[in-house]
Interface confidence: low
């Protein structure tokens, strides 16, 4: 049957342009005394005519399209109309949310992959720093760096890993290698069992100064924000999916049937529902869904606040891509204090000092290749930061999505212009009056009662999840104009600041060492996947006609109306056909 309906849709699509050129229709002919028109319409909807009366009947068994006189509908037809009306409604809802859904799904996938790539680049930069500046550390350093960045990836994706532990593990692992390879390269093999002691001494003696704490602060803050950003996008998908697949109630089905199909029972094939009446019905049907609106608005605004705060130490791209430089600075700090450290560790870890091991602290410029990592510095390169802001701007065009849904669906289904000569659910009227319509409908359904039922359990659940994520987003959002919070001010430095002790200065990166300033060259591997305008059905040029159709600015982004139109085409054409 579905195949037949689909085929019929395509055939009738051509007829539609003749039936509905968009101008006001002439007054409809009197009801068909033989139900012929109703039979031919219903034949397209449901092959076989056994349910359609040959001539008008009393219709005493009808429950929805209550007749004022003889009717061309039977109870079975009414049931079919109800089913079709609910399916049409579900299709319209899915079409309405398609662009928004794709926007979030695409971005969630893209940002997840992009963050993985940032992590990979950060790892490569850090490895390159070791290879160029400390070749004797490379085999082990590569391993520790790899483990650290694997943990970073897992943390972003929600693993229960403590960031401080990750950073501590990195420095705990690095120090024994630095000590035995750089500071005491002549250390005999018998002394190499001191690694555990060195790991402990690393913390007790603060051998890397304030750098581990600085990295902990920056990494934990930037990764927390990144993680919540991804969680929020994934919840956005869940919200749309939930409302996308709502099953409308029987009450709603009856209201929709009255609006879209009951006119046929009277042989009024060309008449359209009154616009005001459509709005009343849609608000009734979507009362539960519209309750999401308040939390959806808050979600987008909270996400915007989060994104606005994602800079400097709250931007993982900036933090991770600059990590190689901070690690390099931390090793230089160890080397500056090599003499003092060697003596202290010699006493603490009690390895035999039978001969004086030469200290391997060399002048900084001997270690630094002036060309190293110049490739990392890319001017005017598009960053994830700009992509995030772009996403927020697009999302903000959907801020009224839920409150605007009833109006949107009415504007995308056939309704009479100016509420003149239209169907009000009971009869053809010259002009629609909401009060008269409500009075006339009292016996048929209680619209107020339908609204008062409250949202479905799935909607309530998604509202709870939105409340939770909104709270998290608010907690994470940074106060404007402040980058560092109280904790960092009290316990550490921001990169570029210096303490009283010159040794604690976390400033420059050494001659020729070039810091990466929030620049990630996406090149071939990422650029295309970040282009969220490449939505299904998107065409690069929209015709004026397309723009006229997609005029509902409050509901969604209309930069590229063909995106929505193409995806809606089949369902809406079928819907037009099935309704009128």
């Amino acid at each position: 049957m579905a195949g037949t309906v689909r085929t019929a849709c395509l055939v009738v699509a051509m007829l539609l342009s003749l039936d509905f050129p968009g101008q006001a229709q002439p007054p409809p002919p009197p009801p068909d005394a033989t139900c012929h028109q109703v039979r031919s319409f219903f034949q397209r909807l449901q092959p076989g005519l056994k349910w359609v009366p040959e001539t008008p009947v009393p219709g005493s068994d009808l429950q929805v399209c209550l007749p004022k006189g003889p009717t061309c509908c039977s109870r079975k037809m009414e049931e079919k109309y109800q089913l079709t009306a609910r399916l049409n409604m579900e299709q319209l809802l899915q079409s309405a949310s398609m662009e928004l859904k794709f926007l979030i799904i695409q971005n969630a996938a893209v940002f997840q992959e992009a963050f993985e790539i940032v992590v990979r680049h950060a790892k490569n930069y850090t490895n390159a720093m070791f290879k160029n500046n400390y070749p004797s550390l490379t085999p082990q350093a590569f391993e520790f760096v790899g483990e650290f960045f694997t943990d970073v990836s897992l943390y972003i994706l929600g693993s229960d890993i403590n960031v401080d532990d990750m950073v501590n593990e990195l420095f705990d692992s690095l120090f024994p290698v630095i000590y035995t390879q750089l500071m005491n390269p002549g250390l005999p093999d018998s002394a190499l069992d001191i690694n555990e002691c060195l790991r402990g001494a690393r913390r007790d003696l603060k051998v890397f100064g304030n750098f581990p704490k600085l990295i902990m602060t920056q990494v934990s803050k930037s990764l927390q924000v990144t993680r919540i950003f991804l969680q929020a996008l994934n919840l956005g998908i869940e919200v749309i999916n939930t409302t996308d697949h709502l099953k409308f109630s029987k009450d709603c089905g009856r209201m929709l049937t009255r609006m879209w199909y009951c006119s046929y029972c009277q042989g009024l094939m060309m008449v359209k529902p009154c616009g005001g009446y459509c709005n009343v019905v849609m608000q009734g049907c979507m009362a539960g869904v519209v309750e999401i609106d308040k939390y959806w608005r808050e979600y987008i605004l909270s996400l915007e606040e989060l994104v606005n705060g994602m800079y400097r130490i709250y931007d993982m791209e900036n933090v991770l891509l600059g990590l190689f430089s901070t690690i390099h600075d931390s090793i230089q700090y160890v080397q500056k204090n090599a003499g003092k450290l060697t003596t202290t560790i010699g006493k603490l870890c009690a390895h035999s000092q039978q001969r004086q091991y030469r200290s391997a602290y060399y002048p900084e410029d001997l270690f630094i290749d002036k060309k190293v990592l110049k490739v990392a510095h890319v001017e005017h390169e598009e960053t994830l930061s700009s992509r995030r802001r772009e996403l927020i701007q697009k999302l903000k065009s959907f801020i009224s999505f839920y409150s605007a849904l009833p109006g949107y669906i009415c504007s995308h289904s056939p309704v009479a212009e100016n509420d003149t000569l239209c169907w009000n659910g009971q009869e053809l009227v010259e002009r629609y009056s909401q009060k008269a319509a409500r009075n006339g409908m009292k016996n048929q359904f209680n619209l107020h009662e339908l609204k008062m039922k409250g949202p479905e359990p799935v909607v309530s659940q998604i509202i709870d999840k939105l409340k939770h994520i909104n709270q998290l987003l608010r907690t994470m959002s940074m106060p404007k104009g402040r980058v560092l919070d109280k904790n960092l001010d009290e316990e550490g430095f921001e990169s570029g600041d210096c303490g009283d002790d010159e040794d604690e200065c976390i400033g420059g990166s050494g001659d020729g060492m070039i810091k990466v300033k929030n620049q990630l060259r996406f090149l071939a591997e990422l650029a295309y996947d970040l282009d969220v305008d490449d939505a299904p059905g998107n065409s690069q040029q929209a015709t004026p006609k397309d723009n006229e159709i997609s005029t509902f600015h409050n509901l969604g982004n209309v930069h590229s109306p063909l995106k929505l139109l193409t995806s809606m085409a089949i369902s809406v054409v079928c819907f037009f056909f099935l309704v009128h």
Epitope: Q106, V119, T150, E525, A527, D529
Partner: antibody, heavy 116, light 105 residues
Framework: DVQLQESGPGLVKPSQSLSLTCTVT?????????WNWIRQFPGNKLEWMAY???????SYNPSLKSRISITRDTAKNQFFLQLNSVTTEDSATYYC?????????WGAGTTVTVSS | QIVLTQSPAIMSASLGEEITLTCSAS?????MHWYQQKSGTSPKLLIY???ILASGVPSRFSGSGSGTFYSLTISSVEAEDAADYYC????????FGGGTKLEIK
């Protein structure tokens, strides 16, 4: 030089599970990139099935998601495919490959026939 | 799911001839990758990110395109180019085209 080699049974009975192994040499599967399974049906149609990223994150083709699993053994530098409830439609040449956005290195492939 | 349609399904070319294989996407994609598969071997990366030649690929191969239409051009066909050619995209997950078989006359 990185090399990938697939291994597994050539013949599987319908409704049983298919298990394949990809052994990687010359490159650590935890260093970077993604490690994929792709199959090619007798008519030469190619289908991406799944990947496991260097960090352990997995992704599956939605059409197979309910019956597919990809895992790895980092110590042996191997990754694995398990496809449950196979039918004759799953008869194909199965390839493992490396790559995120595209696949730059492929194994030679292993042919699997599903038949009773 | 994005569907990639390659045309023609089979192409016959003479040595030295310039030919173009096309790949059409059901929805807009931003990049396309191309593979060559010779009989009895696994696919080999030919071009990635629409137009970048993979390592060791002769310069007679080139790629171009945008949106929903992409092409692979061989400027002067050689006997060793007889093979199946596939396009690949990834937006939400990866899909391959149905392939074009290139035969040499």
């Amino acid at each position: 030089d990185v090399q990938l080699q697939e291994s597994g049974p050539g013949l599987v009975k319908p409704s049983q599970s298919l298990s394949l192994t990809c052994t990687v040499t010359g490159y650590s599967i935890t260093s970077d990139s993604a490690w994929n399974w792709i199959r090619q049906f007798p008519g030469n149609k190619l289908e991406w099935m799944a990947y496991i990223m260097y960090s352990g994150i997995t992704s599956y083709n939605p059409s197979l998601k309910s019956r597919i699993s990809i895992t790895r053994d980092t110590a042996k530098n191997q990754f694995f495919l398990q496809l449950n409830s196979v039918t004759t439609e799953d008869s194909a040449t199965y390839y493992c490959s490396r790559g995120y956005w595209y696949f730059d290195v492929w194994g030679a492939g292993t042919t699997v026939t599903v038949s009773s | 799911q994005i569907v990639l349609t390659q045309s023609p399904a089979i192409m016959s070319a003479s040595l030295g001839e310039e030919i173009t294989l096309t790949c059409s996407a059901s929805s807009s994609v931003s990049y396309m990758h191309w593979y060559q598969q010779k009989s009895g071997t696994s696919p080999k990366l030919l071009i990635y990110s629409t137009s970048i030649l993979a390592s060791g690929v002769p310069s007679r191969f080139s790629g171009s395109g945008s949106g929903t239409f992409y092409s692979l051009t061989i400027s002067s066909v050689e006997a060793e180019d007889a093979a199946d050619y596939y396009c690949l995209q990834w937006i939400t997950y990866r899909t391959f085209g149905g392939g074009t078989k290139l035969e040499i006359k």
